[in-house]
């Protein structure tokens, strides 16, 4: 299945209606002229405005239905209130094939790639290489790795200019977080296994882990009509 199609369905717009011209944006000179022309034109203007409103209303309904359909199709866990309009946080489930680990969705690749290609692959999936906040998150992630002889790239590599391990979000590694086995040198990237954290040459072809943050979405709920 195409993962990107799934993300497209999950990235719902905050506003249910499509962008459309408001009546006030109609050209001003349309409704000017002789009294008879003015009457005819005003009638036409009223008709156009009415048509725009009807189309907008239909668009809102259709878009709302499409969104509802997408939400149901992707098993998004959003409980909708049926009697009043509310705004409250909701939590998206992870897309198919992704594993939930606390507030993240993780995707463990089945193929192998150098670090740069792995980074690019995660980007195409609207995600990033795994960022590990602390030892606790590392252990929980390692528990999902089924064999000791599998290495996975994460989003940490050696910055030659700063002579330090740098996460792909720009922050530097807190040395207490991960105990890295291997050298800190140029062209070194970090991989994790079931039991350890290793410095490997970035050109090495191993598997990788992408992450998507699970963040609350503000969810506008419309009453039944």
């Amino acid at each position: 299945m195409d993962q990107q199609a799934i993300y497209a369905e999950l990235n719902l717009p905050t506003d249910s209606g499509p962008e459309s011209s408001s009546p006030s944006s109609l050209p001003r000179d349309v409704c000017q002229g002789s009294p008879w022309h003015q009457f005819a034109l005003k009638l036409s203007c009223a008709g156009i405005i009415l048509l725009v409103l009807v189309v907008t209303g239909l668009s809102v309904s259709v878009t709302s239905l499409i969104q509802k359909s997408s939400i149901e199709k992707c098993s998004v866990d959003i409980q909708q209130s049926r009697n009043k309009t509310t705004e409250r946080p909701g939590l998206l489930n992870c897309p198919i094939y992704w594993q939930q680990l606390r507030e993240k969705c993780l995707l463990f690749s089945h193929t192998v790639n150098p670090w740069n290609n792995s980074l690019a692959d995660c980007s195409t999936k609207e995600s990033s290489l795994l960022l590990i906040r602390d030892k606790d998150e590392l252990i929980h992630t390692q528990n999902l790795i089924r064999d000791k002889a599998i290495l996975f790239w994460i989003g940490l590599n050696f910055s030659l200019s700063e002579k330090n391990w740098k996460w792909i979000n720009g922050s530097f590694l807190n040395s207490n977080d991960l105990e890295i086995r291997g050298d800190a040198k140029e062209n070194s990237c970090i991989s994790i296994s079931q039991t350890s954290v290793y410095s490997e040459y970035c050109s090495t072809e191993i598997r990788w882990i992408c992450q998507k943050e699970l963040t609350p979405v503000r969810n506008k709920v419309y009453p039944d009509s």
């Epitope: 193929t111 002889a149 599998i150 296994s193 050109s203 090495t204 072809e205 598997r207």
Partner: antibody, heavy 119, light 107 residues
């Protein structure tokens, strides 16, 4: 073209030691996991050990764990297998091969070197 | 450990024959299966990886199939240079294990 050439095999007495080498050329050696696979005379293939590209992670078959040590020198493009406490059942042709980290297969092999453990 | 069982252990065939070798894993290994060809006195050679992907340079008469526990290697039209021993190998988990081999002989 990737080339792997093993050396260091020979006759050794039970309990003895031997060190095998595998010289690699034709690719970025440090970017690949490397492995040793053996084949007893007239028998099938048996995975022995794997080492990651940096040498940081190593893996062994239970039959050799604690007796064999895999290592590599990336500056010399060479893979090693230090074999201690050798037994008669270790007699085999030992191949070095590129790959071995899951899920990769062994895409290049050396010609093999024969290790005979006998008194 | 995952056991790999090949069948038959040996077979006799003629040039031009269609030959199929099967490999069964003792548990599901998804598509983490490779096939190797070995000729007497030579090192094994990787033919197929990930159950069905043909390695570059390997003749198209070789094909692989299957997933889970049951896999096949098929040679659509046996050539003189194909007489050899064939091994399957799982790369799903350590220890990496091989089948016992299937020897393809001339009839």
């Amino acid at each position: 073209e990737v080339q792997l050439v093993e050396s260091g095999g020979g006759l050794v007495q039970p309990g003895g030691s031997l060190r095998l080498s595998c010289a690699a050329s034709g690719s970025t050696f440090s970017s690949y996991a490397m492995s040793w696979v053996r084949q007893a005379p007239g028998k099938g293939l048996e995975w022995v050990s794997t080492i990651s590209g940096s040498g940081g992670s190593t893996y062994y078959a239970d039959s050799v764990k604690g007796r064999f040590t895999i290592s590599r020198d990336n500056s010399r493009n060479t893979l090693y297998l230090q074999m201690n406490s050798l037994r008669a059942e270790d007699t085999a042709v030992y191949y070095c091969a590129r790959g071995g980290l899951i899920p990769s297969g062994f895409d290049y092999w050396g010609q093999g070197t024969l290790v005979t453990v006998s008194s | 450990d995952i056991q790999m069982t090949q069948s038959p252990s040996s077979l006799s065939a003629s040039v031009g024959d269609r030959v199929t070798i099967t490999c069964r894993a003792s548990q599901s290994i998804s598509s983490y299966l490779n096939w190797y060809q070995q000729k007497p006195g030579k090192a094994p050679k990787l033919l197929i990886y990930a159950a069905s992907s043909l390695l570059s340079g390997v003749p198209s008469r070789f094909s692989g199939g299957g997933s889970g526990t049951d896999f096949t290697l098929t040679i659509s039209s046996l050539q003189p240079e194909d007489f050899a021993t064939y091994y399957c190998q799982q790369t799903y988990s350590t220890p990496l294990t091989f089948g016992q081999g299937t020897k393809v002989e001339i009839k």
